[in-house]
Interface confidence: medium
């Protein structure tokens, strides 16, 4: 807290300019009018104030706006945003995407801070849903943003917003998140033709059910092994050898290198060895010839 002292004669700041960098903290407190600061916030970012001086400027704004800053001030906070606490930000009502972009720009290239997380949370809650423009903006600044949301939060993403998602935005998503996003993506891209559809849906397939994988196998999509390895194990297990062969196309040869890893390992254990042999890849571990295959899940359902 800066002590209240009278401004020395001739030092009252008529405007926010670079001469203020030579003011001591107590002089800034005494000689800069808070209302003037609020109207000329856009100038602060261009002036090399130190952390300590920014503390004083923040203190002045806090006194002027105890209930939270208006958006006209927030939009021009610049580096002063780095001084805000999550508690400060919770008092704000940020509705403009331009304001959000301006503040994200200040933190660009750095990890998502608690301040940024709070700001995004306030903004999204204010809008009621993650619309396409917001998602576009957030994933541009933080490619991992989407995967930081809970499945519950993701459920508020409208299918139209999925068009803003790039493959790298889903890199850190877990199966529970993809389970929520996949049906939205399927809906969003439903009017595209086969090959274009596959290009768009590919990164979401970690949430696809068996029947959709079966359908894709009929479309000559040539899924790469990296995508196949991210599929849900429970969705892959019911696929036949012929369906996997069609799904992977020329990439089927890659199964040999992955035969000890899920979901390939578990899928092999469910296939007849005879059928696996037709691939000519030397895959081992299938059900030996002459053995009866019991579908235990079906048996349990009947009993």
């Amino acid at each position: 807290e800066v002590e209240k002292t009278a401004c020395p004669s001739g030092k009252k700041a008529p405007e926010i300019d670079e001469s203020l960098i030579f003011y001591k903290k107590w002089e800034l407190e005494a000689c800069v009018d808070a209302a003037l600061l609020a109207t000329q916030m856009d100038r602060v970012n261009a002036i090399p104030f130190t952390y300590e001086q920014l503390d004083v400027l923040k203190h002045k704004l806090d006194e002027l706006y105890p209930q939270g800053y208006p958006e006209s001030v927030i939009q021009h906070l610049g580096y002063l945003f780095l001084k805000m606490s999550p508690e400060d930000i919770r008092k704000w009502n940020v509705t403009s995407l331009e304001t959000l972009k301006a503040l994200l720009e200040v933190n660009k290239g750095h990890e998502m801070s608690p301040q940024v997380a709070t700001l995004i949370d306030r903004f999204v809650k204010g809008r009621g849903q993650l619309d396409k423009d917001t998602l576009d903006t957030l994933t541009a600044f933080y490619p991992g943003y989407l995967c930081s949301l809970s499945p519950e939060e993701l459920s508020s993403v409208p299918p139209s917003s999925i068009w803003a998602v790039r493959p790298q935005d889903l890199d850190t998503c877990d199966p529970r998140q993809l389970d929520v996003l996949y049906p939205k993506a399927r809906l969003a891209f439903q009017n595209m033709n086969g090959s274009e559809y596959f290009v768009k849906i590919q990164s979401f397939l970690g949430g696809a059910p068996t029947e959709d994988l079966k359908a894709l196998s009929q479309q000559n999509v040539s899924m790469d092994l990296a995508t196949f390895m991210k599929l849900r194990t429970d969705a892959v297990l019911p696929l036949t050898v012929a369906e996997v062969q069609k799904l992977l196309g020329p990439h089927v040869e890659g199964l040999k290198a992955e035969e000890r890893h899920r979901p390939v390992r578990d899928w092999i254990l469910r296939q007849r060895q005879d059928d696996l042999d037709t691939l000519g890849l030397g895959l081992q571990g299938g059900i030996p010839n002459g053995y009866l295959v019991l579908d235990l899940s079906m048996q349990e359902a009947l009993s």
Epitope: I21, P48, F49, T50, Y51, L54, Y79, L82
Partner: nanobody, 117 residues
């Protein structure tokens, strides 16, 4: 983190000149505004001159017309040319970043400037 080493201070008679240098480590040096500060015995540290990443300069009223701040980004160095020195310029001189991204709490040893009358 940027580390700063100041040099070039010494004992000089009033009216004399000195050139201070501040060598900075860190690849991002060129993007930071920089400042020369001084602290006289029993007084608060004060900013004397500042230079932006692009080279624009500002000076405290007490040194305007006498001191010149400059920078060589290729050498990661900031200079302070001090002419027409006065006894009241006697102090330890420090340089530091003036970026809000860098908390100004990591100061170098400084370089002592003593101006005798």
């Amino acid at each position: 983190e940027v580390q700063l080493v100041e040099s070039g201070g010494g004992l000089v008679q009033a009216g004399g000149s000195l050139r201070l240098s501040c060598a900075a480590s860190g690849s991002t040096f060129s993007s930071y505004p920089m400042g020369w500060y001084r602290q006289a015995p029993g007084k608060q540290r004060e900013l004397v001159a500042a230079i932006s990443s692009g080279g624009s300069t500002n000076y405290a009223d007490s040194v305007k017309g006498r001191f010149t701040i400059s920078r060589d980004n290729a050498k990661n160095t900031v200079y302070l040319q001090m002419n027409s020195l006065k006894p009241e310029d006697t102090a330890v001189y420090y340089c530091n970043t003036r970026s809000p991204r860098v908390p100004n709490d990591s100061w170098g040893q400084g370089t002592q400037v003593t101006v005798s009358s």
